[in-house]
Interface confidence: low
């Protein structure tokens, strides 16, 4: 089970919205807070350790997931071509 703790939005840059979200999850042993289908979820801890973010299925159904080149996050590409970038900190 997960709950969103904080959600900050910054729309000051044209054509770009930056959102910072923190979630708190109660996960079983071997799992850790992550993102599945664009919502906070408990995921296999090995995914976080290896930074194979797309293995969490972080994007919505029908979107394409791609790792950022230095594995600092992932992108979700919508069928129309719009790209949402998520970085992990």
């Amino acid at each position: 089970t997960c709950e969103i703790v904080t959600l900050d939005r910054d729309s000051s840059q044209p054509r770009r919205t930056i959102a910072r979200q923190t979630a708190r999850c109660a996960c079983r042993k071997g799992q850790i807070a992550g993102t599945t289908r664009a919502r906070p979820a408990c995921v296999d801890a090995r995914i976080i350790k290896t930074k194979q973010w797309c293995d969490m299925l972080p994007c919505l159904e029908g979107e394409g997931c791609d790792l950022l080149i230095n594995r600092s996050g992932w992108t979700c590409t919508q069928p129309g071509g719009r790209i949402k970038t998520t970085t992990v900190s």
Epitope: L67, L68, I69, N70, R71, S72, T75, T77, T85
Partner: antibody, heavy 115, light 110 residues
């Protein structure tokens, strides 16, 4: 190690396939990129093939260049509709899956397109 | 399309000087940048990846820094053997930006 082969003199419009042969590591766990360099010019990224065989290309290379894995030790670059602008040394390089770094390069193979 | 603007195109330095080469990306590349050294008739060799991670075997006088769109390769105490052309390579996602090289910087040692 990485070694390219197949470079030669061809006439415009001719298709050509280059081969990259690797040893000492596995294509099932490493990314491979193709990069080219025209005489006296800078480097130009062509595209990449993932261990899963997913491929991505530079926008200018889409449609005319195709990267494929032909065995556990070889990757090919198929080029069609070659023009004199494609004259270059073609390099194959192992790309780290942790960053954009290409940490092992072949010596390159020269492709000359001329009528 | 991602553009990597590399400056200066060429520079001349004396042994022991500090050399800085800058690459400016046309959009945020999330530290997805690497730096290469190339000598005539040789393939490039990787110096730095992930903006600041020094490749094994590369002398510590080479360092990388930067974030967002602005990145720098620094050679502290340049040596005669550092005469070469240096390239940055940037991109954050193969599917969206792919990778783009900077135009290169030719470093001459006086």
């Amino acid at each position: 190690s990485v070694e390219e082969s197949g470079g030669r003199l061809v006439t415009p419009g001719t298709p050509l396939t280059l081969t990259c042969t690797v040893s000492g590591f596995s294509l099932s766990s490493d990314y491979m990129s193709w990069v080219r360099q025209a005489p006296g010019e800078g480097l130009e990224w062509i595209g990449i093939i993932y261990p899963s065989t997913t491929t991505y290309y530079a926008s200018w290379a889409k449609g005319r260049f195709t990267i494929s894995k032909t065995s556990s030790t070889t990757v090919e670059l198929k080029m069609t509709s070659l023009t004199t602008e494609d004259t270059a040394t073609y390099f194959c390089a192992r790309g780290s899956n942790w960053s954009s770094g290409m940490n092992l390069w072949g010596p390159g193979t020269l492709v000359t397109v001329s009528s | 399309e991602l553009v990597m603007t590399q400056t200066p195109p060429s520079l001349s330095a004396s042994v022991g000087e500090t050399v800085r080469i800058r690459c400016l990306a046309s959009e945020d590349i999330y530290s997805g940048i690497s730096w290469y050294q190339q000598k005539p008739e040789k393939p490039p060799t990787l110096l730095i990846s992930g903006a600041s991670n020094l490749e094994s075997g590369v002398p510590p006088r080479f360092s990388g820094s930067g974030s967002g769109t602005d990145y720098t390769l620094t050679i502290g105490g340049v040596q005669a053997e550092d005469a070469a052309t240096y390239y940055c390579l940037g991109g954050y996602s193969y599917s969206s930006t792919g990778l783009t090289f900077g135009a290169g910087t030719n470093v001459e040692i006086k």
